[in-house]
């Protein structure tokens, strides 16, 4: 169930000036749908800098097979993994390890999934006669989003990774089927 590198494509996401990052989606651990809901925007930009090149949020492309029980998708699916830091580069740790994240009292920004898409996959099952299909929730884009101190770290867990059949849920359901819940819904569907 490991991730397989597909290519080293990395798209850098640069927040537009004047457009403030949003809080991360909240994960519903409800078997079927993990709906991502975006919260309100902060009243002001937390950084003094206007140099957008100091922000770095990359979309890494990976491929994986979707599995469900003993079944596996006929073809691998490609999705994005969000990577990188969202913040002025000058405030991030440097190679020597000096410096810190930005001021502790300030808001935290993370590179996390922004939009999702659903993709239907055909599953090949040993001994199976009927064609089986599932819909998987794949990350379609990443964004720097504001994480307030009230957000729990656990909310950032596994963003962008669809467990092998995550708990049943929405179209998404790769096999980790016990987690059916990961099936999170596709936010962009609404």
């Amino acid at each position: 169930q490991g991730w397989q590198a597909f290519k080293n494509d990395a798209t850098e996401i640069i927040p537009e000036l004047g457009e403030y990052p949003e809080p991360p989606p909240e994960l519903e651990n409800n078997k079927t749908m993990n709906r991502a809901e975006n919260g309100g925007r902060p009243p002001h930009h937390p950084f003094e800098t206007k140099d957008v090149s100091e922000y770095s949020c990359r979309e890494l492309h990976f491929t994986r097979y979707v599995t469900d029980g003993p079944c596996r998708s006929a073809k691998p699916v490609t999705e994005l993994v969000c990577s990188g830091q969202c913040g002025p580069a000058r405030l991030l740790p440097n190679a020597i390890g000096r410096g810190k994240w930005w001021r502790p009292s300030g808001p935290d920004f993370r590179c996390i999934p922004d939009r999702y898409r659903a993709q239907r996959v055909q599953l090949l099952c040993p001994g199976g006669e009927a064609p089986r299909a599932r819909k998987v929730r794949l990350v379609a884009s990443c964004k720097c989003k504001r994480l307030t101190r009230f957000h729990n770290q656990s909310e950032l867990k596994d963003f962008g990774t669809e467990a092998a059949r995550p708990q049943k849920g929405r179209k998404p359901r790769p096999r980790a089927r016990s987690a059916k819940a990961n099936q999170a819904e596709l936010e962009n569907a609404y």
Epitope: M33, G69, P70, C125, R132, A133, K168, R170, K171
Partner: antibody
Framework: EVQLQQSVAELVRPGASVKLSCTAS????????MHWVKQRPDQGLEWIGW????????EYASKFQGKATMTADTSSNTAYLQLSSLTSEDTAVYYC???????????WGLGTTLTVSS | DIVMTQSHKFMSTSVGDRVSITCKAS??????VAWYQQKPGQSPKLLIY???TRHTGVPDRFTGSGSGTDYTLTISDVQSEDLADYFC?????????FGGGTKLEIK
């Protein structure tokens, strides 16, 4: 919160048709498969079929071909089951249920009780 | 069509006991089996899929097992709220079919 809302009951004359609805909230039906299941009083469950609302693909149990027609309206996030040429054998509770696969059912509506009677 | 047979229409047990509900398929269904619980006046709820994988939020006292044609749902430490009908379902071959159900009664 995931919810599937169905009308509580329908009373229909023999020979007529009826269209049952299932409106989803908390998720987009395009990201799932919608299934319909029949349960007659004090009896077991019968799978009618599934529809992929995203593209209209359907699969029916042979028993229900010609009897049932599944459709979906993604703009209203609603799935429909139309039953035709109704007889007393069609009197049952009809459930809509959904999952990210075309083979098992994660969430269920409360069911619509269909009574066919003159 | 594949016939799913639940030989016991009724089973009686006591709180704290362990009970096993069986389901036999008319042909090999390759673990493509789910179990549902239906309480009186409610819609069914998924408990187990792929024969042994517990659905999210289902108490670990519910365990599924089996392969080939024989499948079992075991409830250990039965609770009063487990009073319900239990149905097995196969999704190996179309049409997906259900067992006739087993009603669990609490003494």
């Amino acid at each position: 919160e995931v919810q599937l809302q169905q009308s509580v009951a329908e009373l229909v004359r023999p020979g007529a048709s009826v269209k049952l609805s299932c409106t989803a909230s908390g998720f987009n039906i395009k990201s799932t498969f919608m299934h319909w299941v029949k349960q007659r009083p004090d009896q077991g469950l019968e799978w009618i079929g599934w529809i992929d609302p995203e593209n209209g693909d359907t699969e029916y149990a042979s028993k229900f071909q010609g009897k049932a027609t599944m459709t979906a309206d993604t703009s209203s996030n609603t799935a429909y089951l139309q039953l035709s040429s109704l007889t007393s054998e069609d009197t049952a509770v009809y459930y809509c249920t959904t999952g990210e696969s075309n083979y098992d059912f994660d969430f269920w509506g409360l069911g619509t009780t269909l009574t066919v009677s003159s | 069509d594949i016939v799913m047979t639940q030989s016991h229409k009724f089973m009686s047990t006591s709180v704290g006991d362990r009970v096993s509900i069986t389901c036999k398929a008319s042909q090999d269904v390759s673990t493509a089996v789910a179990w549902y619980q239906q309480k009186p006046g409610q819609s069914p709820k998924l408990l187990i899929y792929w024969a042994s994988t517990r659905h999210t939020g289902v108490p670990d006292r519910f365990t599924g097992s089996g392969s080939g044609t024989d499948y079992t749902l075991t409830i250990s430490d039965v609770q009063s709220e487990d009073l319900a009908d239990y149905f097995c379902q196969q999704y190996s071959n179309y049409p997906w079919t259900f067992g006739g159900g087993t009603k669990l009664e609490i003494k």
